[in-house]
Amino acid sequence: CDLPQTHSLGNRRALILLAQMGRISPFSCLKDRHDFGLPQEEFDGNQFQKTQAISVLHEMIQQTFNLFSTEDSSAAWEQSLLEKFSTELYQQLNNLEACVIQEVGMEETPLMNEDSILAVRKYFQRITLYLTEKKYSPCAWEVVRAEIMRSLSFSTNLQKILRRKD
């Protein structure tokens, strides 16, 4: 399954929107910085097959979409930018979903790397718990916004590797 070029453009647009969503200076939130343990090895496109990488990408985008679809998120961000950002993610999910469905239908496809899915889920659990702990403060959201920009950048790199594998 070939991800359309528009998928990468969408990812870049999502990153730009996320950058624009910043409301406060990151420097005023230095005391709130946190290492969420982004599972970088899951974004090493050479580590596993394309079909598995697409499942990991889907999980990453889906969890990001869910994170920014909460009521707490709606209260934290400028509404029109948040809606545009969510729309970009939703479009990416549709592209990835079509690919995963195609792979699921092929019986020779190897089993999904479930530990990679779990690693992504745990990463977002750490982010969720951090926000809860910090009571969804503006600085907590700013730290999370910066972290998601980082994780989306990693997923962009993974997509580039996947296209080279075609």
Partner: antibody, heavy 119, light 108 residues
Framework: QVQLQQPGAELVKPGASVKLSCKAS????????MHWVKQRPGQGLEWIGE????????IYNENFKSKATLTVDKSSITAFMQLSSLTSEDSAVYFC????????????WGQGTLVTVSA | QIVLTQSPAIMSASPGEKVTLTCSAG???????LYWYQQKPGSSPKLWIY???NLASGVPARFSGSGSGTSYSLTISSMEAEDAASYFC?????????FGSGTKLEIK
């Protein structure tokens, strides 16, 4: 609000199969993995597996791989679990539960379907 | 798979009494992925405590959770009649996800 609706009971004969349903409402069905859990009378809970309704990928507990098959129908926002070659060991209540994170992990459960395997 | 052992299997407590239920894991579980559920007869389980020590919405403040590694506990500071139920610990730190066999808590 989030709801997961399951039929109350199913009576099936040994050796037969049964397909249990879990109809979701109150949230975007394709955004969250759906899990299935078994509970024998007066016993603990056993995780059977999960399915991502968005694309149909499944992850199973090895103990249930040859027993359960998880599927979804996006058009009717319903998750299904087929149990095959039923024996008395399969008589139990089967719950569906929605995934999520933090305070949303297994925060929503169906009422459970009691499966009775009897001749 | 990670086996979760709960003790005691059944216990009874008087109103006002302090109660501690334990959950022992066969191998280490990260505290972020250790949860507790309450279940009453004829009902589905209810999320009670998430990530070891956080109370789910609507759970009374007399409940608390603690632990790390292989040893976890749920404590009720002052038992009330409505707390009579079964309590299950659960881990999703690694596949397959597992539950404890449960502790049935009765009121004296």
């Amino acid at each position: 609000q989030v709801q997961l609706q399951q039929p109350g009971a199913e009576l099936v004969k040994p050796g037969a199969s049964v397909k249990l349903s879990c109809k979701a409402s109150g949230y975007t069905f394709t955004n969250y993995w759906m899990h299935w859990v078994k509970q024998r009378p007066g016993q603990g809970l056993e995780w059977i597996g999960e399915i991502n309704p968005s694309h149909g990928r499944t992850i199973y507990n090895e103990n249930f791989k040859s027993k359960a098959t998880l599927t979804v129908d996006k058009s009717s926002i319903t998750a299904f679990m087929q149990l095959s070659s039923l024996t008395s060991e399969d008589s139990a209540v089967y719950f569906c539960a929605r995934g999520g994170l933090g305070p949303a992990w297994f925060a929503y459960w169906g009422q459970g379907t009691l499966v009775t395997v009897s001749a | 798979q990670i086996v979760l052992t709960q003790s005691p299997a059944i216990m009874s407590a008087s109103p006002g009494e302090k109660v501690t239920l334990t959950c022992s894991a066969g191998s280490s579980v990260d505290s972020s992925y250790l949860y507790w559920y309450q279940q009453k007869p004829g009902s589905s389980p209810k999320l009670w405590i998430y990530s070891t020590s956080n109370l789910a919405s609507g759970v009374p403040a007399r409940f608390s959770g603690s632990g790390s590694g292989t040893s976890y506990s749920l404590t009720i500071s002052s038992m009330e009649a409505e707390d009579a139920a079964s309590y299950f610990c659960h881990q999703w730190s690694s596949y397959p996800f597992t539950f404890g066999s449960g502790t049935k808590l009765e009121i004296k």
